[in-house]
Amino acid sequence: EVEKTACPSGKKAREIDESLIFYKKWELEACVDAALLATQMDRVNAIPFTYEQLDVLKHKLDELYPQGYPESVIQHLGYLFLKMSPEDIRKWNVTSLETLKALLEVNKGHEMSPQVATLIDRFVKGRGQLDKDTLDTLTAFYPGYLCSLSPEELSSVPPSSIWAVRPQDLDTCDPRQLDVLYPKARLAFQNMNGSEYFVKIQSFLGGAPTEDLKALSQQNVSMDLATFMKLRTDAVLPLTVAEVQKLLGPHVEGLKAEERHRPVRDWILRQRQDDLDTLGLGLQGGIPNGYLVLDLSMQEALS
């Protein structure tokens, strides 16, 4: 807290300008009127106030707006945003995408702070859904943003927003998140032709079911091994050797290097050894010839 002291003669601020950077903290407190500050917030970010001076300016705004700042002030916070706590931000009502962009710009190049996370949460909740423009903005600043959302939160993403998603935005998504995103992507890209469709859907395939993988295997897509390794194990297991061969095309040779890793390892255990031998890759661990395979899961479903 800055002590209340009288403003020295001739130092009362008539406007927010560069001369204020030479004011000590107590002088800013005593000589800058909070209402003046609020109406001239657009000037604050053009003046290189120090971190400590910003404390005083924040204190003044807090006194003026105890219930939370209006958007006209929030929009121009600039570096003052770095001084805000999540508790401060929870009092705000941010509706403009321009305001969101302006505040994210201040934090650019840094990891997502609790303040930014709270701001985004307030903004998205206020909008009711994660629309394309918002998603475009958020993933531009934070490529990992999408994967930081829970499956429940992701369910509010409309399929049209999926067009804004870049492959790198999904790098840190887990299978539960891809399970939610994949059907949306499938819907979003449904009118594209085969090869274009595969390029777009590829990074979402970690959420694809078996039947979709079977369908892709009929389209000469030549899936790379990196994508294959991210597929759901339960979706890969029912695929036949022929289907995997068609799905991977020339990349099928890469299975050998991955034979000890999931989902390849588990898939090999489910295939007949003589089917695996047809690939000519030396894959071992399949079901020996003459053995009968019982699908117990099917038996349980029938009983």
Epitope: I21, K24, K25, A46, P48, T50, Y51, E52, L82
Partner: antibody
Framework: QVQLVQSGAEVKKPGASVKVSCKAS????????MHWVRQAPGQGLEWMGM????????IYYEKFQGRVTMTVDKSISTAYMELSRLRSDDTAVYYC?????????????WGQGTLVTVSS | DIVMTQSPDSLAVSLGERATINCKAS??????VAWYQQKPGQSPKLLIY???TRHTGVPDRFTGSGSGTDFTLTISSLQAEDVAVYFC?????????FGAGTKLEIK
């Protein structure tokens, strides 16, 4: 990488003016305040002021007000510091420097310095 | 203006030994203090900011500490390449001010 390359040494007579240049590269010139700091022989460092290349806003330390002029030429990413009515105690190495985060005014990058000698 | 008083003016320390440089601010500056290293004929280089945060690429033998008015730069095990003049700077308020410097030499 960020580079600030300054003009060469100058010898001036008392009462004259000197103009030192600082050519920036490796970053967006208009993004950061350009500061000027001087160092008299064997002495500490003294902050003189700053200019924002995007807005041409200048902020001068009171001690130099009226004698210093900071300008920029955006087209060639160059900042200038002119000091007039030179005195012998203005003999110093003059540095340009940039601060990446204005709220944390620590000097992240410096020019190599320009020695200005004021002597009759 | 905030005056930064550095001590000692010069310091001679044996290789591998600890070197300690102090800086005192005339007013409370919180942790808004930076330290610079200046080798002969070169411009200063940022070592520490926020009183204790090492700048990118600075060896961990350099440590900053302190808050309020008293600050310390410590070099835990002096190396030959550490011979230089060291300056503190406050950035709590303008004008930005520096200490007069401490010349560090090898004993």
């Amino acid at each position: 990488q960020v580079q600030l390359v300054q003009s060469g040494a100058e010898v001036k007579k008392p009462g004259a003016s000197v103009k030192v240049s600082c050519k920036a590269s490796g970053y967006t010139f208009t993004s950061y305040w350009m500061h000027w700091v001087r160092q008299a022989p064997g002495q500490g460092l003294e902050w003189m002021g700053m200019i924002h290349p995007n807005s041409d806003n200048t902020i001068y330390y009171e001690k130099f007000q009226g004698r210093v002029t900071m300008t920029v030429d955006k087209s060639i990413s160059t900042a200038y510091m002119e000091l007039s009515r030179l005195r012998s105690d203005d003999t110093a190495v003059y540095y340009c420097a940039i601060i990446i985060t204005p709220v944390v005014p620590k000097f992240d990058y410096w020019g190599q310095g320009t020695l200005v000698t004021v002597s009759s | 203006d905030i005056v930064m008083t550095q001590s000692p003016d010069s310091l001679a320390v044996s290789l591998g030994e600890r070197a300690t440089i102090n800086c005192k601010a005339s007013h409370d500056v919180g942790t808004s203090v930076a330290w610079y290293q200046q080798k002969p004929g070169q411009s200063p280089k940022l070592l520490i900011y926020w009183a204790s945060t090492r700048h990118t690429g600075v060896p961990d033998r350099f440590t900053g500490s302190g808050s309020g008015t008293d600050f310390t730069l410590t070099i835990s095990s002096l190396q030959a390449e550490d011979v230089a003049v060291y300056f503190c700077q406050q950035y709590s308020s303008y004008p930005l001010t520096f200490g007069a410097g401490t010349k560090l030499e090898i004993k």
